[in-house]
Structure formats: C-alpha cells, structure tokens
Amino acid sequence: SSSPTSSASSFSSSAPFLASAVSAQPPLPDQCPALCECSEAARTVKCVNRNLTEVPTDLPAYVRNLFLTGNQLAVLPAGAFARRPPLAELAALNLSGSRLDEVRAGAFEHLPSLRQLDLSHNPLADLSPFAFSGSNASVSAPSPLVELILNHIVPPEDERQNRSFEGMVVAALLAGRALQGLRRLELASNHFLYLPRDVLAQLPSLRHLDLSNNSLVSLTYVSFRNLTHLESLHLEDNALKVLHNGTLAELQGLPHIRVFLDNNPWVCDCHMADMVTWLKETEVVQGKDRLTCAYPEKMRNRVLLELNSADLDCDPILPPSLQTS
C-alpha cells in the first residue's frame, strides 16, 4: 500500500511564534510553515495537533506526504490546496480528526498526484457532491485518488440537516464518475443503515471495501457483480440477519474475494438454510467457524457451520381465521 509513514527523519520545525503569512510569492524551497515539522528528505510535512484553523498557505512544493491531523479546520473551501506553483507531488493527505464539518466542491482540486486521502474522524455534516470530482459536470476529469478513507465521518444526529447521510456520501463518491480508479474505500463506523444500490457498480476498480461497524441490515439490493477485482469486503459488526441466494452467488463469483462477517446478529431460522449450506462449501468467508446465531433465543450462540436443516425452522404463520387478537 502507499500509506505515508510517520517515521520521516530529519524534521525541521518552524518557530511556533512565526505567523503564517498569506503571500502571492511562492514559498522558499526549504520553507516550513509555522506550527509544522518538515522533512525534505522524506518529502513529508506534519502539522499535527496544532489547533490550526486553516490549511497553511506556505506549504513547501516538495511535499509528498502531508499530515494535517488533530486540528480545528472546520471548513475546507474550494481550492484549499491550490498553490502557485501547484503541490504537484502531493500523493498522501491525512486530514483525520481535524473537526471538519464541511468539505466544499473542488476542495482537492489542483492536486494532480493525490492518490490517498484520509478524512476519517471528522463530523462531516456537509460533504459536497463535488468534493472529490471538483465540478458538477456529468462526467468529470478522472480523479487521481486510489485510496479514500472515510471512517467515522458521521456527524451527530442533530447536525445531519434532515437528509440521508448515506445519500450524501454516495453522491460525493459517484459525482462525475471521477472515482472510477478508486482501489480502496473505507466507510467504517458511519451508522449506515443501507448501501445505495448504485454505488458499487460505479466503482469498478475497487480491491478493498470496508463497511464494518455500521448498521447494515440487508444486502438484498446491493450488487457486487461488477467488482471483478474486489479482494476484501469487511462487513463485521453490522446488523446483518441473513445473506440471501443472490448475494451469495455474486460473492462466490468474485475470483479474489475474502469476506469478513464476524459479529452480526444472524437469525437462524428457515431463511438461513441457503447461507448455512453456502458457508459449509465456500472458501470466501474468513473466520467462518466464528459465526454464531443471535436469534431466535433458542439458537443463540450456536455455530452456523454446525447447523443442519432440521435446526432451521420457522414458526408457522397462522391463517387469519386462526389468529387471535
């Protein structure tokens, strides 16, 4: 993976009392913004836990890995990283935990080499549909992004502006078909109740998808069919009750897939029979011997792989004439 390392050597630190001046002049090649640490040898700039309220204007042109974590940025405006000359080498940008609640259209424009972006642990109440595509064209220029990390970006309930959070995130992922080259997408810990059905079909290059620790109840309307290159699908710690035949067949048809299903409240009734049969045969599911029933009560903690058809019954549905009030 291309993750930036934090073991950069020979950092030079800017004197903390220097003001970060906005200047039309390009920064000096060896200049380091106030409150940041820079290593030209490692092409890395770290402005970490400094309570910055805006992106420094005087970032050195050599920066390849930029850490802006643990700040108070609040808003990323359009062209937040646009510089003259541009930050042409910036490949990995980490903005996690920086109190961002708004990312505007074109926030990441003019970063031609940006491969990896981490916005995790920010309460993104307002993520523009064009945050990643940069424009509202129906087909945008392809984004260079390959890894997009959006774990725990769900805002508090009262800040969600009366709209679907899932819908807002998906709109940003799909706008302009700009993210067709995305290989890793992490959306863990976002309280997702559902996955909009069109999202995966438009991300054909995905190799790793992390949807763990959400509240997904069903995958019935989600299609994995076109994700030929998908290698890992993390669905741990959701609210999945059962996987139905269509989903099972699609997953089995992906040549490299490994699926992680731990800690879901599996309902072990007659609807579970197909999944149990599949689990016994498949090599797709990692740690399948750890999967246990949560419901009904009589089946709690039973291992799915140890069940047979006689164990999986449904209470008969009484005809209306026999139902009591």
């Epitope: 993976s1 290989r183 890992s232 990692q286």
Partner: antibody, heavy 118, light 113 residues
C-alpha cells in the same frame, strides 16, 4: 521484519523436476499476491507466475502446464513446482510480493539459482 | 503475446546528465497506469523505483520521475549520480477476461561514459 526468502534451487537434469520455496515473514500471505520472476544469466527479467491472496493462479503462456504455483498461508510459504525442465529454464528465480493496492512488485527476495544441465 | 519494448537497450552517460528511457507496450496496461520501473545492479535483486506510472516508491530520490499513460511511458533521471549506473526495467500489468498477465521490458543498461 518484512521479507521474503527463496530456497530450493540447484542442479537438475533436463526433463527433471524441482520445487522452489519462498518463506514470507512479517506479513500475512492471505492478504497479498505473490509472484515468481526469473532471470537467465546475462538476460532480463521474465515474469513466471502469480498467486492471489485467496489462491487464484495465473501463468506466463510458456509456463502453463509445466510450472505450478501454490502456497500455504498458515506456514507463510509460496512454492513453484517446476516439471519437464529444459536448459533454457536455467536462471535465478526471484520471489516477489505484490502491493496490496497497486499491481507492482514492491518486495523482492535475493533469488535462488536453478541450473538445468546434463 | 504482450510485448514491452524499452529504448534504448543501452546508453552511456556522465554524472550530472539528464537521462530518459522509454517503454512502449503492445497493449494498454491495466487502468492505463499500472506500469512500474525497477533498478537492478549486478548480483542484486531488482528494486522498485516508480509505480502507477509516476508515483515514486518510498526512499527513492526525487531525481527519478516517471510519466506516461496507456501504452507509452518514460523514466527520467534528472541529474545522474554515480550510484544510478545500473540496468532499468519497466513492468506492465494487464487484465483480460482470462485473468492477469505481467510483462517486463528487455531492460536498459546505463553505463558510465
């Protein structure tokens, strides 16, 4: 320490067989694709075969039918079984790990030498 | 059969020179940018320099750069250093309905003038 180390090379007669091993350490084989690449004396690099994290296998057209790649995730081992060996298979054989995101060989072993001669 | 052709096959240059090596693929590489460059010194394993056509691998000096897309790619060394004299290989990754295929160029030997 993350590394791969090849072994199993040696002298073999034409028509014979040999199994090369690659020991992976510091990472989980189930999460990475692994490949074999060879280099004949004084020649360039030549891709041989690759095995995906879950075990799917792919081969150079000339290697199909004679060479078989396999692995044991729990032991951290990748293997290349070579049958019906010919003089032109004489080479240094490298084991290489593939990046988890990009399709590039980002970790190489030092190679093991195979000599096919009578 | 996919073929990667590097040019030149060999070249002589001096310390401080700017050097360019090209790599042409008979088919487009996967996603138009799955092209890597490696450096190999005698008796040693290859070392990854550039991946994804233009992304510098960790620890590689910035005098190395890569460009290109689809079938035509370039490796540039902006100012040759003594340790850069070696053989350079391009490598493409390809995907079709029948699966994955990888190929290397024949190599470019960079020698001291």
């Amino acid at each position: 320490e993350v590394k791969v180390e090849e072994s199993g090379g040696g002298l073999v007669q034409p028509g014979g067989s040999l199994r090369l091993s690659c020991a992976a350490s510091g990472f989980s084989l189930s999460s990475y694709w692994m490949s074999w690449v060879r280099q004949a004396p004084g020649k360039g690099l030549e891709w041989v075969s690759i095995i995906a994290g879950r075990g799917s296998t792919y081969y150079a057209s000339w290697a199909k039918g004679r060479f078989t790649i396999s692995k044991d995730n729990s032991e951290g081992m990748v293997y290349l079984q070579m049958n019906s060996l010919r003089a032109e298979d004489t080479a240094v054989y490298y084991c290489a790990r593939v990046s988890s995101i990009y399709y590039t060989f980002n970790l190489w072993g030092q190679g093991t030498t195979v000599t096919v001669s009578s | 059969e996919i073929v990667l052709t590097q040019s030149p096959s060999s070249l002589s240059a001096s310390v401080g020179d700017r050097v360019t090596i090209t790599c042409q693929s008979s088919q487009s590489v996967y996603s138009n940018n799955e092209l890597s460059w490696y450096q190999q010194k005698p008796g040693k394993a290859p070392k990854l320099l550039i991946y994804y056509a233009s992304t510098l691998a960790s620890g590689v000096p910035s005098r190395f750069s890569g460009s290109g897309s689809g079938t035509d790619f370039t490796l540039t060394i902006s100012s040759l250093q003594p340790e850069d004299f070696a053989t350079y290989y391009c490598q493409g990754s390809y995907y079709s309905g029948s699966g994955w295929y990888y190929a290397f160029g024949q190599g470019t030997k960079l020698e001291i003038k």
